[in-house]
Each structure stands twice: as C-alpha cells, then as structure tokens.
C-alpha cells in the first residue's frame, strides 16, 4: 500500500507522459489522477513502467472502479492486464471481440494463465455461445483451447463455428470431446463432396460411429494410419477386414506396425484369421478357422 502524500511541486501529471517512468511509487500515487489514467490507458503501454509502478497504476484504477473496470478501460489495459487477478476479471463485462483480442495479444506466446482462462470464460458466458469469430480468435491464440473445454461446454459450440477449427486445434482432445464435436462437424461439412469432405472431417473422426466409418470405406478415402489409430475402439471393432482395407487403401500395410496397439490389436482379435491372411501382412491373433463367434451382446438383446 502506497501512503498518501502530497504531490511535489511541478510533478502533477496533466497527461500520461514518458517522464513518469522516473516517478517513484509514492509520486505516481500522489501525482497521477485516476480519471486521467483511465482515459489515457493506451499511453501507458508505450511507457516501460516497472512492475512496481504498474501496481500503483492498477491500485488507482481499482479505487476508481471498485465494481470492475468499464470496457473502454479494459480494451486499453495492455500489459497492465498481466497485473490483474482472476478475481478482478470476474468483475468485468467484456462483450467486444476487439477487447478480447487486445488482451490475448498481451499474453501471446505464453501458456494460458488463470487470468486469460477467466477472461475467456467471462466473454463466452456473456455471448451465450462459442460463435465462429470467437472460436477463430481463441484457437488462433491457443490452438489447444477447444480441447480444454468440457463436453458440456463443447455442446454450446454451433456447427457453423466448426469451420474455424484447424487439425492442430484437436490434437489434445480426448474421445469424449470428439464425441461431441464430430456430429457438429458432420453437419457443418455435409454439403461438401467426397474428397473435400474427408479432408475436413478427418481430424474429427475420433468421435465417429461405426456406420459412418463403413460409409467412408465405400468412398476410396485412403485414411492414414495416424487417423485410424485415433478412432474409437468400439467404432472400429465391427468393421470387416474388407472395410478396413477399403478405408485405409494403400495405407493398410501400416497395420502390421501397429498390430500390438489399440484399436488395431482389439480389431485383430475380432477378425477371422482367414480374413486377416487375405491382407498378406502377416497379422496374427485372429479367430482360428472353424471357431464359432457368438455375439453375446446380440444374444442378450434378443432375450
């Protein structure tokens, strides 16, 4: 806390000026009017104030706006934003995408801080849904943003926003998140032709059900092994050898290298060895010839 002292003669600030970097903390407190600071926040960013000096400037704004800063001030906070706590940010009402961009720019190149997470949360809740422009902005700054959301939060993403998603944005998504995103992507890209559709939908396929994989196998898509390995095990298991062969096309040879890893391992265990042999890859572990496969789940359903 900076104690209240009178401003020395000749040091009263009439605008935010670069001479202020020489002011000590108590002089900034005494000589810089909070209302002046609020109207000239953009100038603060042009001046290399120390963190201690920024503490004083923040304190002045806090006193002026105890209920939270207005957006006109927030938009020009610049690197003073780094001084804000999540508690401070929860008092804000940020509605402008430009304000969001300006503050994300300050934190650019760093991990998502609790301040940024709170800011984004406030912004998205204020908008009611994660629209395309917002998603575009957030994934541009934080490629992993989408995968940091819960399936419940992802459910508010409108299909139109899916167009903003890049493959790298989904790198850290788990199956539960892809389960939510895949139907939205399918809806978003439904009017595209076969090959273009596959390019767009590919990174979302970790949420695809069996019937969609079967449909894709009829379209000569040549899915790469990396994509195949991210598919849901329960969606892959019912696929026949012929369907997997069609789905992977020339990439089918890669199954050998992955035969000990899920979902390939589990899929092999469900296939007849005869059928696996037709691939000519030396895949082992299939159901031996002459064995009868009982689908117990089907039996239970019938009873």
């Amino acid at each position: 806390e900076v104690e209240k002292t009178a401003c020395p003669s000749g040091k009263k600030a009439r605008e935010i000026d670069e001479s202020l970097i020489f002011y000590k903390k108590w002089e900034l407190e005494a000589c810089v009017d909070a209302a002046l600071l609020a109207t000239q926040m953009d100038r603060v960013n042009a001046i290399p104030f120390t963190y201690e000096q920024l503490d004083v400037l923040k304190h002045k704004l806090d006193e002026l706006y105890p209920q939270g800063y207005p957006e006109s001030v927030i938009q020009h906070l610049g690197y003073l934003f780094l001084k804000m706590s999540p508690e401070d940010i929860r008092k804000w009402n940020v509605t402008s995408l430009e304000t969001l961009k300006a503050l994300l720019e300050v934190n650019k190149g760093h991990e998502m801080s609790p301040q940024v997470a709170t800011l984004i949360d406030r912004f998205v809740k204020g908008r009611g849904q994660l629209d395309k422009d917002t998603l575009d902005t957030l994934t541009a700054f934080y490629p992993g943003y989408l995968c940091s959301l819960s399936p419940e939060e992802l459910s508010s993403v409108p299909p139109s926003s899916i167009w903003a998603v890049r493959p790298q944005d989904l790198d850290t998504c788990d199956p539960r998140q892809l389960d939510v995103l895949y139907p939205k992507a399918r809806l978003a890209f439904q009017n595209m032709n076969g090959s273009e559709y596959f390019v767009k939908i590919q990174s979302f396929l970790g949420g695809a059900p069996t019937e969609d994989l079967k449909a894709l196998s009829q379209q000569n898509v040549s899915m790469d092994l990396a994509t195949f390995m991210k598919l849901r095990t329960d969606a892959v298991l019912p696929l026949t050898v012929a369907e997997v062969q069609k789905l992977l096309g020339p990439h089918v040879e890669g199954l050998k290298a992955e035969e000990r890893h899920r979902p390939v391992r589990d899929w092999i265990l469900r296939q007849r060895q005869d059928d696996l042999d037709t691939l000519g890859l030396g895949l082992q572990g299939g159901i031996p010839n002459g064995y009868l496969v009982l689908d117990l789940s089907m039996q239970e359903a019938l009873s």
Epitope: S19, F22, C31
Partner: antibody, heavy 121, light 107 residues
Framework: QVQLVESGGGLVQPGGSLRLSCAAS????????MSWVRQAPGKGLEWVSA????????FYADSVKGRFTISRDNSKNTLYLQMNSLRAEDTAVYYC??????????????WGQGTLVTVSS | DIVLTQSPATLSLSPGERATLSCRAS??????LAWYQQKPGQAPRLLIY???SRATGVPARFSGSGSGTDFTLTISSLEPEDFATYYC?????????FGQGTKVEIK
C-alpha cells in the same frame, strides 16, 4: 553538498574493456536515477546511458547498445559503466550525472568532473 | 530521433549586452527543455529546467522560454563569467538529446 567523483578512465586499445566508477555523496543516492554523458575532445555532449534509482530499468544510446552496461550499487553509493569492445570513437571525457525530473521534464542537475577515456592503438 | 539545432553556433557580445540563444527541435516535442552552461575544462552546469525554471543558485539574469519546437535562453545582461558554451537538452522516447552548443564569446 552533492558530489560526484568519476574514476577508472585511461588509455585502452580498440576492442578492449574498461570499467568506470562514480562515487556519490551529499545526497540519498538510492533516491535518484543516474546517467553517464560523454564529450569527445572539442565536441558537444552526448548522452550514453541511464539507470533507475532501484536498477529496475536501464536505457542506452544506440551508439553503445550491446557494448556498454550501466549498473549501480546503492549500498556503496556508486554508479558503474562497463565498456566493452571499445572503439576509437568512444574516446571522450565521461561524466557521471544525477537525473532529476518534473512532469514532462527530465534533466541532469549535478555533474561530476569527468574521467578521460582514450581508445587508441 | 529528435534533433536539437542550436543557433547561432557562436555569439560575439560585450559584457552588459543581452544574449538570445535559440534551440529548435526537428519535431514538436511535448516535453520541456533544459539548458546547461559549460566552461573550458569544467563539467556542465544546469541553468534552466522545464523550459523556464531556474536551477538552484542560478542568477535571475538567466531565463528560459518556448514550447513545441522553438526554445530560447536569454541572458539579460552578460557578466564576464557568462562567456561559455551553452547546450540545450531534451528527454524524448527514453533517451536524451543535446544540441550541438552555442559559444558565447567576448566581442
């Protein structure tokens, strides 16, 4: 009364290094930003570098950036200028000066007598 | 960078005369100017800061004025000890700039 006394000047070869010191007395050294200003023989004044009272920020003229380093030890009331990769054009009298300021006005209110640095082979 | 140009380079006057020294900035500067006096073999001495405030111990015959791009140092009546070189100085963009100096010599 305020006194600033520079030392450490001398003859040095191009590419060499030198460390200047400025001993301050007669005022609370830790309350003031400090600076180095130089003057080549028969020429005008040229600002070199400045440092905040608490060493939180430092500033340099483009002509010395990357070669000179300003520092201070408030416990010893001393200002320093480490000069590396010296060139012939760095030859000058180097003054230590105290920085004072008002709103929109930053100036040097007290100066030392200077120490001569000669860079020559 | 802002360049400060002082004129004239040399001013030849007699004791008792009025000296008017000019300092012009290459662009409008929001900050205030300072003026220094330097005698041969001596360190500079602060005369005027904030464009018009006299430093401690500076005689009243020295006065400063101006703003924007044009600043003036006036010595109302030259004393023998006033014959020296005078420099203007500006703080801008976190660096300090000096003018090239005006030498006031005895006519």
């Amino acid at each position: 009364q305020v006194q600033l006394v520079e030392s450490g000047g001398g003859l040095v070869q191009p590419g060499g290094s030198l460390r200047l010191s400025c001993a301050a007395s007669g005022f609370t050294f830790s309350d003031y930003a400090m600076s180095w200003v130089r003057q080549a023989p028969g020429k005008g004044l040229e600002w070199v570098s400045a440092i905040m009272y608490d060493s939180s920020s430092t500033f340099y003229a483009d002509s010395v950036k990357g070669r000179f380093t300003i520092s201070r030890d408030n416990s010893k009331n001393t200002l320093y200028l480490q000069m590396n990769s010296l060139r012939a054009e760095d030859t000058a009298v180097y003054y230590c000066a105290r920085i004072n300021y008002i709103y929109k006005g930053v100036h040097f209110d007290y100066w030392g007598q200077g120490t001569l640095v000669t860079v020559s082979s | 960078d802002i360049v400060l140009t002082q004129s004239p380079a040399t001013l030849s006057l007699s004791p008792g005369e009025r000296a008017t020294l000019s300092c012009r900035a290459s662009q409008i500067v929001s900050g205030y100017l300072a003026w220094y006096q330097q005698k041969p073999g001596q360190a500079p001495r602060l005369l005027i800061y904030g464009a018009s405030s006299r430093a401690t111990g500076v005689p009243a015959r020295f006065s400063g004025s101006g703003s924007g791009t044009d600043f003036t140092l006036t010595i109302s009546s030259l004393e023998p000890e006033d014959f020296a070189t005078y420099y203007c100085q500006q703080y801008y963009n976190f660096s300090f700039t000096f003018g090239q100096g005006t030498k006031v010599e005895i006519k």
